[in-house]
């Protein structure tokens, strides 16, 4: 079972209209540049076999990957949204730094790895897709962690 007290974000993190709006606008702008609409990164497959109490830990992994492998490398694009959204998401990541799972998390790592592989396989268009799904990442993170 996860150490659930650490796998939590305060509701107030998601009750800031300005940054919420900027996150959704960034996602919308990137999704317009996404020509691969058949693939969805944040969907049922990502959460397959993951219990309610493990969802936040999974989303922490997805958030960290998105920041390190997608947003930082693409930080010069989709301005001015990117320069505001990235620090916000980085703060959420920092607040989840003590979120861990005791015991086996292989099923979670397997699901996250499939998402990583899909992004890597698609190359730059995979990174654009991940940015285009920041609205889903924001909402999924909220739903899993509050």
């Amino acid at each position: 079972a996860p150490i659930s007290s650490h796998c939590r974000l305060d509701k107030s993190n998601f009750q800031q209209p300005y940054i919420t709006n900027r996150t959704f606008m960034l996602a919308k702008e990137a999704s317009l540049a996404d020509n691969n609409t058949d693939v969805r990164l944040i969907g049922e497959k990502l959460f397959h076999g993951v219990s309610m109490s493990e969802r936040c830990y999974l989303m922490k992994q997805v958030l960290n990957f998105t920041l390190e492998e997608v947003l930082f490398p693409q930080s010069d694009r989709f301005q001015p949204y990117m320069q505001e959204v990235v620090p916000f998401l980085a703060r959420l990541s920092n607040r989840l730094s003590t979120c861990h799972i005791e015991g086996d998390d292989l099923h979670i790592q397997r699901n996250v790895q499939k998402l990583k592989d899909t992004v890597k396989k698609l190359g730059e268009s995979g990174e654009i897709k991940a940015i285009g799904e920041l609205d889903l990442l924001f909402m999924s993170l909220r739903n899993a962690c509050i």
Epitope: I42, G49, S51, L136, M139, R142
Partner: antibody, heavy 119, light 112 residues
């Protein structure tokens, strides 16, 4: 093909008990949370409770104490145990698969089983 | 617990009509809203989730919109098989789990 089939409904006297079953096929039950929802005749849908992958259960406040959800993954079956039944529990009872996609969505649903509480 | 108010509770329409059903939440539910269709004597069927994402196999004449507290289900051109009752359903996280899932009262779409 994914299928959910409820059974165990019928006529029961007030104060009586009933156990409903939801047999699933076409997917691995152990990978999904499952919910129970009921619908009184001519009325809307009412959530009863949910059983998570790890067996944790959560109930609507009105259902706590009288209703119990359990699962047997080896039998591909989810159960709803109902005790101290009242006339107002008369309804069609549905089970549904909970697909979490970042938000919980219920899909698909079983065909339902009718429970009538009457003397 | 969040309360979902659907309007109208019933409506009469003809084949080919554009139909709009609204669902109002008593508190901010972001985009945590789904729509279900239920035909008489049948189980509910998922139509839309994330307020606007069409479920697999659902015809494109169905669409959803909204966020926060106000949501809309639109059928662009009503077909004979669309006469049914429609329910909105919200997921509310972060509160007590005993009120996580809530359904609206339903909107019955009848033949004019």
């Amino acid at each position: 093909e994914v299928q959910l089939v409820e059974s165990g409904g019928g006529l029961v006297q007030p104060g009586g008990s009933l156990r409903l079953s939801c047999a699933v096929s076409g997917f691995s039950l152990s990978s999904y949370a499952m919910i129970w929802v009921r619908q009184a005749p001519g009325k809307g849908l009412e959530w009863i409770g949910i059983i998570d992958i790890d067996g944790s259960t959560y109930y609507a406040s009105w259902a706590k104490g009288r209703f119990t959800i359990s699962r047997d993954n080896s039998k591909n079956t989810v159960y709803l145990q109902m005790n101290s039944l009242r006339a107002e529990d008369t309804a069609v009872y549905y089970c549904a698969r909970d697909r979490f996609v970042g938000v919980d969505i219920f899909d698909p649903w079983g065909q339902g089983t009718l429970v009538t509480v009457s003397s | 617990a969040v309360v979902l108010t659907q309007s109208p509770s019933s409506l009469s329409a003809s084949v080919g009509d554009r139909v709009t059903i609204t669902c109002q939440a008593s508190e901010d539910i972001y985009t945590n809203l789904a729509w279900y269709q239920q035909k008489p004597g049948k189980a509910p069927k998922l139509l839309i989730y994330w307020a606007s994402t069409l479920a697999s196999g659902v015809p494109s004449r169905f669409s959803g919109s909204g966020s926060g507290t106000d949501f809309t289900l639109t059928i662009s051109s009503l077909q004979p098989e669309d006469f049914a009752t429609y329910y909105c359903q919200a997921c509310v996280y972060g509160n007590s789990a005993d009120s996580r899932y809530t359904f609206g009262g339903g909107t019955k779409v009848e033949i004019k």
